[in-house]
């Protein structure tokens, strides 16, 4: 059963390592894949002394942990590299860190990426 499924056809693309990887730095990435597979968008970033540094954004292959996620939200507490994925066109344009620990109440820290 699939409820309210959101098709992903394109995602915001960013690659901080674009020169070494020989890719564009930023743009819109069309998401390709087998027709029976779902597609997602993702974002990865680091928090260096309170400053957000985006590592990569783009399309993400079919991954059940990305199903039913309309917003790109990292919920893990204090990861080394932040990661989120979502379903829906350009859903990785905005991403946020919303740590959820089992005991304490979560607090939201929305991040709007501004690739330099």
């Amino acid at each position: 059963a699939i409820l309210g499924r959101s098709e992903t056809q394109e995602c915001l693309f960013f690659n901080a390592n674009w020169e070494k990887d020989r890719t564009n730095q930023t743009g819109v990435e069309p998401c390709y894949g087998d027709k029976d597979k779902r597609r997602h968008c993702f974002a990865t970033w680091k928090n260096i002394s309170g400053s957000i540094e985006i590592v990569k954004q783009g399309c993400w292959l079919d991954d059940i942990n990305c199903y039913d996620r309309t917003d790109c939200v990292e919920k893990k507490d204090s990861p080394e590299v932040y990661f989120c994925c979502c379903e829906g066109n350009m859903c990785n344009e905005k991403f946020s860190y919303f740590p959820e620990m089992e005991v304490t109440q979560p607090t939201s820290n929305p991040v709007t990426p501004k690739p330099v």
């Epitope: 059963a1 029976d36 779902r38 079919d62 991954d63 059940i64």
Partner: antibody
């Protein structure tokens, strides 16, 4: 420490029902997809069912479709498998498994034995 | 119906190297199937060894490595030890919420 504790297994007659539970702790349950995997005596592992983070998407192997229902209660940190119209070939140890990004099973429970026999 | 195939059994000498493979009947295995490998000893729950083709799970020794060899996923054990004697399962994520396990390989460490 991540822990997954299955319960609810036992002996049941063919055509009967059982409800398995998997109590999760040590991680934020509502952030991860979950799955059930079974192993018949002396046989290999077989994927049975999976469920997305919200419970909005559920999936089954062909042999249990229409008989088994997977669900989750994120407020109770518990995964369920409702098994109806049980058959002898459903006899197995049932494991619950946490699913991590890249869709792999990163933690497993110790399993609960379901025996379907008259 | 997708069938994932593994060698039913394999043997290796202590200190030797063995490569177990995982293929399927519908084409080539690629990284998009997120191949993962699990070790199981009798009476125990499976243990995660390799995920996402070639990433070792936490605490897994670097004797275990994963790769794509030709059109199959592969698990290589170098410097095999007696306690590597186990059943090994590969799993492919077919997408859209569906996983398929291989039939498993029973590894015997000789001697």
């Amino acid at each position: 420490e991540v822990q997954l504790l299955e319960s609810g297994g036992g002996l049941v007659q063919p055509g009967g029902s059982l409800r398995l539970s998997c109590a999760a702790s040590g991680f934020t349950f509502r952030n991860y997809a979950m799955s059930w995997v079974r192993q018949a005596p002396g046989k290999g592992l077989e994927w049975v069912s999976g469920i997305s983070v919200t419970g909005g998407s559920t999936y089954y192997t062909d042999s249990v479709k229409g008989r088994f229902t997977v669900s989750r209660d994120n407020s109770r940190n518990t995964l369920y498998l409702q098994m109806n119209s049980l058959r002898a070939e459903d006899t197995a140890v049932y494991y619950c498994a946490k699913v991590y990004y890249s869709s792999f099973f990163d933690y497993w429970g110790q399993g609960t034995l379901v025996t379907v026999s008259s | 119906q997708t069938v994932v195939t593994q060698e039913p059994s394999f043997s290796v000498s202590p200190g030797g190297t063995v490569t177990l493979t995982c293929g399927f009947n519908s084409g080539s295995v690629s990284t998009s199937y997120y191949p993962s490998w699990y070790q199981q000893t009798p009476g125990q729950a499976p243990r995660t060894l390799i995920y996402n083709t070639n990433t070792r799970s936490s605490g897994v020794p670097d004797r275990f490595s994963g790769s794509i060899l030709g059109n199959k996923a592969a698990l290589t054990i170098t410097g095999a030890q007696a306690d590597d004697e186990s059943d090994y399962y590969c799993v492919l994520y077919m997408g859209s919420g569906i996983w398929v396990f291989g039939g498993g390989t029973k590894l015997t460490v000789l001697g």
